[in-house]
């Protein structure tokens, strides 16, 4: 039950995270005009990975796409690539994890296959989350560098006669969405990996050999002085799981492929 919950929660958290990564990638507000300590303008500039926008006080917003590929900064291209890789891996991870969910039955899929799929999706979510966090962090670093550069040359002009205020950019909402989404995807991936451990069918260390006496039924188990004495047909054989002796009543029952949760 705990494994199913962990797997399900991991899936949901990753789903939210990937939706957030997609949202962040599509958002226009990766960098926004810094309003602090600047003259108040009737124009607000903000930029995304795909286009830059200008919102005027009039209410009119104009967005222009970056219609060049070669003319864009290498860092921007790298961020785009990281975000897209994150989305692709996340999407594949989601697809894999749907079939890996314990609550979904596909034919006669073995638990071992489900465990492998869960692990695969978990790793994909972790890498996806890391890609998003890396992409957003690279962009943030780029912004910080440019911010201090433009602060150093805040005013430029002809002999100081005419002042041209340089537009400085600061962190936009998309960066925070990206960080949170990347973190959620990462957490979801870790949860899937944890769930995988519980899903894997555990092999018995020893094969139990039972000897039935006529009146007295004694089960001898090599590898430990663990034996059970029972009377008549009430005898319950004990299986040793990882060296621990527990009655079948006590052994945690993992749903087999015939169980419906």
């Amino acid at each position: 039950m705990a494994v199913t919950a962990c797997q399900g929660l991991g899936f949901v958290v990753s789903l939210i995270g990937i939706a957030g990564i997609i949202a962040a990638t599509c958002m226009d507000q990766w960098s926004t005009q810094d309003l602090y300590n600047n003259p108040v303008t009737a124009v607000f500039n903000y930029q995304g990975l795909w286009r830059s926008c200008v919102r005027e006080s009039s209410g009119f917003t104009e967005c222009r796409g970056y219609f060049t590929l070669l003319g864009l900064p290498a860092m921007l291209q790298a961020v785009r690539a990281l975000m897209i890789v994150g989305i692709v891996l996340g999407a594949i991870g989601l697809l894999v994890s749907i079939f890996a969910l314990k609550c979904i039955r596909i034919g006669s899929m073995e638990d071992s296959a489900k465990a492998n799929m869960t692990l695969t999706s978990g790793i994909m979510f972790i890498v996806s989350g890391l890609c998003a966090i890396a992409g957003v962090s690279v962009f943030a670093n780029m912004l910080v560098t440019n911010f201090w550069m433009s602060t150093a040359n805040m005013y430029t002009g002809m002999g100081g006669m005419v002042q041209t205020v340089q537009t400085r950019y600061t962190f936009g909402a998309a960066l925070f969405v990206g960080w949170v989404a990347g973190g959620l995807t990462l957490i979801g991936g870790v949860m899937m990996c944890i769930a995988c451990r519980g899903l894997a069918p555990e092999e018995t260390n020893y094969k139990a050999v039972s000897y039935h006496a006529s009146g007295h039924s004694v089960a001898y188990k090599p590898g430990g002085f663990k034996a059970s004495t029972g009377f008549g047909s009430n005898t319950k054989n004990k299986k040793i799981y990882d060296g621990g002796a527990r009655t079948e009543d006590e052994v945690q029952s993992y749903p087999s492929k015939h169980d419906y949760v």
């Epitope: 003259p39 500039n45 830059s52």
Partner: antibody, heavy 118, light 113 residues
């Protein structure tokens, strides 16, 4: 057709108050930033106040800050300018304007005259 | 505050003449985000509110005759009337639409000789 009609002007004593209204029609009022501009006799226009479409951003000219309040009622398609502590230098024709591309004042009303005199 | 300086303060012209008036701002009105200059030109006739002629320094408002042309960038702007008509006699104002407060120039009065 875009139409802006100002009202509420008149003669007022120094230190007095007045509330101007601007009824808008012919466009989506809640989509545009609006402004008040005044023009003293034989002088050039002077921007007074601005309010964004959602009233999130409000700006005033230094000469009126603390004395004038701009507001809008999008449900009624109406812009307001509440003026208090009026001075003789506030005497002017007050125009209501709708902003357009480039933050230009694309449409103007015919104005309402405010006279501050003892 | 941004200071808008218009010159000359008045112009005496004859019909059909080409007229040029200047407007200078104390700071650049060029927005780096869209490479547009936030400068507007208005025409005002006696007893009327100002009328929008040109926005973004060079974009003509719809319905404005093509004899009106705006040019310039950064801090120096020009309004040109290629062939002055009698109905063009008015006061022309430039306005900063980039920084608050949204300041106007003192105007250039166009008069007939």
């Amino acid at each position: 057709e875009v139409k802006l009609v100002e009202s509420g002007g008149g003669l007022v004593q120094p230190g007095g108050s007045l509330k101007l209204s601007c009824a808008a029609s012919g466009f989506g009022f809640s989509d545009y930033g609006m402004a008040w501009v005044r023009q003293a006799p034989r002088k050039g226009p002077e921007w007074v106040a601005f309010i964004s479409n959602s009233a999130y951003s409000i700006y005033y000219a230094d000469t009126v800050t603390g004395r004038f309040t701009i507001s809008r009622e999008n449900a009624k398609n109406t812009l307001y300018l509440e003026m208090s502590s009026l001075r003789s230098e506030d005497t002017a024709m007050y125009y209501c304007a709708r902003l357009g591309y480039g933050n230009s004042f694309a449409y103007w009303g015919q104005g309402t005259l405010v006279t501050v005199s003892a | 505050d941004i200071v808008m300086t218009q010159s000359p303060s008045s112009l005496t012209v004859t019909a059909g003449e080409k007229v040029t008036m200047s407007c200078k701002s104390s700071q650049s009105l060029l927005n780096s985000g869209n490479q547009k200059n936030y400068l507007t030109w208005y025409q005002q006739k006696p007893g009327q509110p100002p009328k929008l002629l040109i926005y973004w320094a060079s974009t003509r408002e719809s319905g404005v005759p093509d004899r009106f042309t705006g040019s310039g960038s950064g801090t120096d702007f020009t309004l040109t009337i290629s062939s002055v008509q009698a109905e063009d006699l008015a006061v022309y104002y430039c306005q900063n639409n980039y920084y608050y407060p949204l300041t106007f120039g003192a105007g250039t009065k166009l008069e007939l000789k």
